[in-house]
Amino acid sequence: EEELQVIQPEKSVSVAAGESATLNCTATSLIPVGPIQWFRGVGPGRELIYHQKEGHFPRVTPVSDPTKRNNMDFSIRISNITPADAGTYYCVKFRKGSPDVELKSGAGTELSVRAKPS
């Protein structure tokens, strides 16, 4: 199994309410195969924000075309940010399995939300 790293370059991102937040994430390898998921928080109560292979996430858009076979950019854009979106977001690589197996997590990016400028 090849060594794989999940890189979240920004430790923190600050966004004004109502704007979009871009959370960056890249992987250093496509192997082992398996999906990327984004979560807010850690542990069993973490919230799924985006799943590469299934689900409907109307406020979340991949930054890069996820259908490219060589895509290793798993950055996402979250629209219409509100104070409720504040928290630390983790980009997590899974290895295929039944169920998929969590392999590597990025270090996390803390999203803070500023008041909407008047």
Partner: antibody
Framework: DVQLVDSGGGVVRPGESLRLSCAAS????????MSWVRQAPGKGLEWLAG????????YYIDSVKGRFTISRDNSKNSLYLQMNSLTAEDTAVYYC???????????WGLGTLVTVSS | ALTQPASVSANPGETVKITCSGG??????YGWYQQKSPGSAPVTVI????KRPSDIPSRFSGSASGSAATLTITGVRVEDEAVYFC???????????FGAGTTLTVL
Amino acid sequence: DVQLVDSGGGVVRPGESLRLSCAASGFTFSSYAMSWVRQAPGKGLEWLAGISAGGSDTYYIDSVKGRFTISRDNSKNSLYLQMNSLTAEDTAVYYCARETWNHLFDYWGLGTLVTVSS
Amino acid sequence: ALTQPASVSANPGETVKITCSGGDYYSTYYGWYQQKSPGSAPVTVIHSDDKRPSDIPSRFSGSASGSAATLTITGVRVEDEAVYFCGAYDGRTYINTFGAGTTLTVL
């Protein structure tokens, strides 16, 4: 319902060209990667080419690289395969197929027959 | 190259397993495609190793382990008689490949 309708097949002479089309409906075409797969008489399936959802990235099997070109027009919900310098070995039924998130196939066209004969 | 048996046969109601070998587990996803007659459109019965499309009966299931994938039909029916192709996507090469096909005969 997802529908893929292949067209453009026919009888051509060796060395000639042909352009196949695949009309898609029942899903958001611009969100999915697509592929072409063929089946020669009495033979198995052979993947030929794939294209990312946005159309910027293309992938080919070595045997058709340089002769075949996959393309798409998302405004027309259409996929194409331009085939040049055809030989008798290209005689087959050609299918378009929609890709899953991990580049397998979930829906297939009905197929269009290409016959290369002198 | 993907290797699968040329043919299998079973009586109605029996369980059929078709294996497909040749992929590297860490870089490969498998799918299974049913073709009822030559030149007719294939139908996907399994993708992503074990995912069954919503319109495919629950008697079809898939699994992958090591360098092989398996299609299982539990309680096979006469209408399941077809050629089954395994397919694979390799994340190292970005290439799709298919096995030569397995003819399922329901006696």
